[in-house]
Amino acid sequence: MAVTACQGLGFVVSLIGIAGIIAATCMDQWSTQDLYNNPVTAVFNYQGLWRSCVRESSGFTECRGYFTLLGLPAMLQAVRALMIVGIVLGAIGLLVSIFALKCIRIGSMEDSAKANMTLTSGIMFIVSGLCAIAGVSVFANMLVTNFWMSTANMYTGMGGMVQTVQTRYTFGAALFVGWVAGGLTLIGGVMMCIACRGLAPEETNYKAVSYHASGHSVAYKPGGFKASTGFGSNTKNKKIYDGGARTEDEVQSYPSKHDYV
């Protein structure tokens, strides 16, 4: 019951997180005009990953997309890539985790398969959350750097008589949405991984296999081994299962860290 709750909660938390990552990626307010210590203007500038907007005090808002790909800063492209990778991984993770949910029955899917899928989706959520946090953090770092550069320009670039309003940008709402959403996705992923441990059956009962010794009819029922979930040390136990001898490595394969690069 606790496992189902942990898995379900992990799924819901990740779902909210991924929705937040999508929202943050689409939002226009990644950076907003800094109003502190600036001349008060009748226009308000803000920028997103895909377009920049100007809201006039009169109520009119005009947004223009970045219609160039090569002319954009490499950092912005990197942030876009991180966010998109986060969304894609998160979406795949959601799809996998739906089938992995203990409360949903799909054919005769084994608990071990569900455990695998839960772990896979958990890792995907973790990577997705990290991508979002990394993307938002890179953008925030870019803003901080530009902010101090433009602040320096404000005080050094006034040699002439004509003053220019230096528009400085600070953190927009999308950054906070992105950080929170990335964190939620990460937490959801961890919960899925935790749920995976409890999903794999503690005791696996196998069909009785008769061993006929000469002269005696002795039926031997082997005791069940603990099923490995990849967290235990018992990964090389050989078992007779339905008449076929296989190692657990062949029965269950787990994603390595290289699967998600």
């Epitope: 203007t41 009748a42 226009v43 006039e56 004509v162 003053q163 309003v165």
Partner: antibody
């Protein structure tokens, strides 16, 4: 269509307060702002202040201590109040609606105010 | 406050003549966000309310004849009437619509020769 109409007292004694009402139609005060401009006889235009759709206000720095602008969205009215009047406050007072580029695209016909004892 | 300087203060012109007037601001009116200059031109005929001619320094308001052209960027702006008409006799004001307070220039009066 968009219309703005100012109504004022016409004559005000020095040191008294001036109250002018601008009644608008054809647009919502919740969305759009209203600016106030005055013009002393034979002189140029002087921007007084503005109240935007969100209720925020900005005033001319020389008048900030004695000018206030407020509005009643439900009645579609904007109110200008100028305290401690002097003779050089004699002017025609206009209310106008800012549009694209914050430019005032619609103007009232103006109300003439004379400050005299 | 931004100071808006208009020149000349008055101009005597003849019908059909090309008219140019200038407006200078003490600070740049160019917004980096959309690369637009928040400078507006108004026309005021005697006994009338001002009328919007041009906003964003060069965008004509609908209904304004195309003989009126606004140009310039940053701090220097120009209003040009390509062919002066009798009905264009008025005072022309420029206004800063960017930084508060939204100050006006003193105006340029057009008179007929």
């Amino acid at each position: 269509q968009v219309q703005l109409k100012e109504s004022g007292p016409g004559l005000v004694a020095p040191s008294q307060s001036l109250s002018i009402t601008c009644t608008v139609s054809g647009f919502a005060l919740t969305t759009y702002g209203v600016s106030w401009v005055r013009q002393p006889p034979g002189k140029g235009l002087e921007w007084l202040g503005v109240i935007w759709g969100d209720g925020s206000t900005h005033y001319h720095s020389a008048l900030i201590s004695r000018l206030s602008i407020r509005k009643d969205n439900s009645k579609s009215q904007v109110f200008l109040k100028l305290n401690s009047l002097q003779t050089d406050d004699t002017a025609t007072y206009y209310c106008a609606k800012p549009g694209r580029g914050n430019a005032m695209d619609y103007w009232g016909q103006g109300t003439s105010v004379t400050v005299s004892s | 406050d931004i100071v808006m300087s208009q020149s000349p203060s008055s101009l005597t012109v003849t019908a059909g003549e090309k008219v140019t007037m200038s407006c200078k601001s003490s600070q740049s009116l160019l917004n980096s966000g959309n690369q637009k200059n928040y400078l507006t031109w108004y026309q005021q005929k005697p006994g009338q309310s001002p009328k919007l001619l041009i906003y964003w320094a060069s965008t004509r308001e609908s209904g304004v004849p195309d003989r009126f052209t606004g140009s310039g960027s940053g701090t220097d702006f120009t209003l040009t009437i390509s062919s002066m008409q009798a009905e264009d006799l008025a005072v022309y004001y420029c206004q800063n619509d960017y930084i508060y307070p939204l100050t006006f220039g003193a105006g340029t009066m057009l008179e007929l020769k």
